[in-house]
Interface confidence: low
C-alpha cells in the first residue's frame, strides 16, 4: 500500500440547520482516473462509516441516494457536505481517500474534522 | 471478442536489438493498462511492466529498465516492447497482458507469447 | 519489492483428490492476490482474483482464500485437464511478482 497525504480542516461548526460542509484535498501521487472518498466518524473510540462515493475523475460524486453526505470534486479536492446532524453527532470525521485506479493503490487517510452541532433552541412560546 | 496477438518468434545475435508487437482487439485499447511479462525457458513469470495507452504513461520493473522500453501506438492499436542489447539469458517467451481496470486488479486477456532466441 | 513465497514448488496427485496450494507474499496484500493456471507452451489463464473471485468460466472446483499474507489456492476434485503448473501474483502496487510456480503432476 502506498501511502498519501490527505489535508482536511480541524474543526467545522455545523450551520443551524445541521449542515457541516468541509474540503478533503488530497496530494495525488499520479494520474487517478478512479477515486473512492469515505468519510468516517470516530466517537468514543468508535469508527464508523458515515458515507462513501467512488467517482471518475471529472465527474461528480455520486453517494447512495439514502446518504447523508453529497460532494463535488474538483481536481484533488473533495468539497463533502453532511446533511441532518443533530448535537449528538459531533464528533471527529475523518476522510478517507482511495486512488483506485490505475495501479498503484495509494490510501491516505485525514487527520479529521471535529464538527460540532448544537441542536437550535426551541422557538418560545408565542401569546399572537 | 477480446484478443491480443503477438508477433512471431524470433532468432537474433547477441548484442542486437528486438521489437515486439501485441495486436489488440475487441475492447477499448486506450482505457486498459497492457502488461508485459517474461518466462524464461523452465522457469516461472515475470512481470516486465505496463503501459497506458491513452497517454503512453508506463511503469517499469526497475530489474528491466536497462533493457526495455514498452511504447503504444493508439491508432493501430498495438503495443510494443523493445528488447536491446541482447544477451543469452534474455531468451525467454515474452507476453503481453491486459489488465482489468477495476480494483481489485488482475491479467483478464494474454496474448499467445512470443518466442525470442538470443544466439550466434 | 514484495516476494511471493509459493509452495509446494511440485505436486504429485490423482485424479479426484483435494489439492491445495500456499502463497506467503512478504507483506500484507489486502487480497490483491491472483492466481493463474499454465499449461506447457500456452499462455497463463486466469483463475482466481482479488483473492477469492472466480474469474469467468472457471469451474466452481476451484477456490481462493486468505488475506493479509496467507493465500490458497484449492482444488476439490482434481479433473485430468487442471494437471498444469499454478502461480499466484500480487498487484498490491508495482513490480507484480509473481510466486515461483507450483507444477501440479499425476501420481
Known amino acids: 500500500c502506498k501511502a498519501m497525504h490527505v489535508a482536511q480542516p480541524a474543526v467545522v461548526l455545523a450551520s443551524s440547520r445541521g449542515i457541516a460542509s468541509f474540503v478533503c484535498e488530497y496530494a495525488s501521487p499520479g494520474k487517478a482516473t478512479e477515486v473512492r472518498v469515505t468519510v468516517l466518524r470516530q466517537a468514543d473510540s468508535q469508527v464508523t462509516e458515515v458515507c462513501a462515493a467512488t467517482y471518475m475523475m471529472g465527474n461528480e460524486l455520486t453517494f447512495l441516494d439514502d446518504s447523508i453526505c453529497t460532494g463535488t470534486s474538483s481536481g484533488n479536492q473533495v468539497n463533502l457536505t453532511i446533511q441532518g446532524l443533530r448535537a449528538m453527532d459531533t464528533g471527529l470525521y475523518i476522510c478517507k481517500v482511495e486512488l483506485m485506479y490505475p495501479p498503484p493503490y495509494y490510501l491516505g487517510i485525514g487527520n479529521g474534522t471535529q464538527i460540532y452541532v448544537i441542536d437550535p433552541e426551541p422557538c418560545p412560546d408565542s401569546d399572537f | 471478442e477480446v484478443q491480443l496477438v503477438q508477433s512471431g518468434a524470433v532468432l537474433v545475435k547477441p548484442g542486437a536489438s528486438v521489437k515486439v508487437s501485441c495486436k489488440a482487439s475487441?475492447?477499448?485499447?486506450?482505457?486498459?493498462?497492457m502488461n508485459w511479462v517474461r518466462q524464461r525457458p523452465g522457469k516461472g513469470l515475470e512481470w516486465i511492466g505496463m503501459?497506458?495507452?491513452?497517454?503512453?504513461?508506463?511503469s517499469l520493473n526497475q530489474a528491466f529498465k536497462d533493457k526495455v522500453t514498452i511504447t503504444a501506438d493508439e491508432s493501430t492499436s498495438t503495443a510494443y516492447m523493445q528488447l536491446s542489447s541482447l544477451r543469452s539469458e534474455d531468451t525467454a517467451v515474452y507476453y503481453c497482458?491486459?489488465?482489468?481496470?477495476?480494483?481489485?486488479?488482475?491479467?483478464?486477456?494474454w496474448g499467445q507469447g512470443t518466442t525470442v532466441t538470443v544466439s550466434s | 519489492d514484495i516476494q511471493m513465497t509459493q509452495s509446494p514448488s511440485s505436486l504429485s496427485a490423482s485424479v479426484g483428490d483435494r489439492v491445495t496450494i500456499t502463497c506467503r507474499p512478504s507483506?500484507?496484500?489486502?487480497?490483491?492476490l491472483a492466481w493463474y493456471q499454465q499449461k506447457p507452451g500456452k499462455a497463463p489463464k486466469l483463475l482466481l482474483y482479488?483473492?477469492?473471485n472466480l474469474a469467468d468460466g472457471v469451474p466452481s472446483r476451484f477456490s481462493g482464500s486468505g488475506s493479509g499474507t496467507d493465500y490458497t489456492l484449492t482444488i476439490s476434485s482434481l479433473q485430468p485437464e487442471d494437471f498444469a503448473t499454478y502461480y499466484c501474483?500480487?498487484?498490491?502496487?508495482?513490480?507484480?511478482?509473481f510466486g515461483q510456480g507450483t507444477k501440479l503432476e499425476i501420481k
Open positions: 497482458a491486459r489488465m482489468g481496470r477495476r480494483n481489485p486488479y488482475y491479467f483478464d486477456y
Open positions: 475487441g475492447y477499448s485499447f486506450t482505457t486498459y493498462w
Open positions: 503501459i497506458h495507452p491513452s497517454d503512453s504513461e508506463t
Open positions: 507483506e500484507n496484500l489486502y487480497t490483491n
Open positions: 482479488g483473492a477469492t
Open positions: 501474483q500480487h498487484l498490491w502496487g508495482t513490480p507484480f511478482t
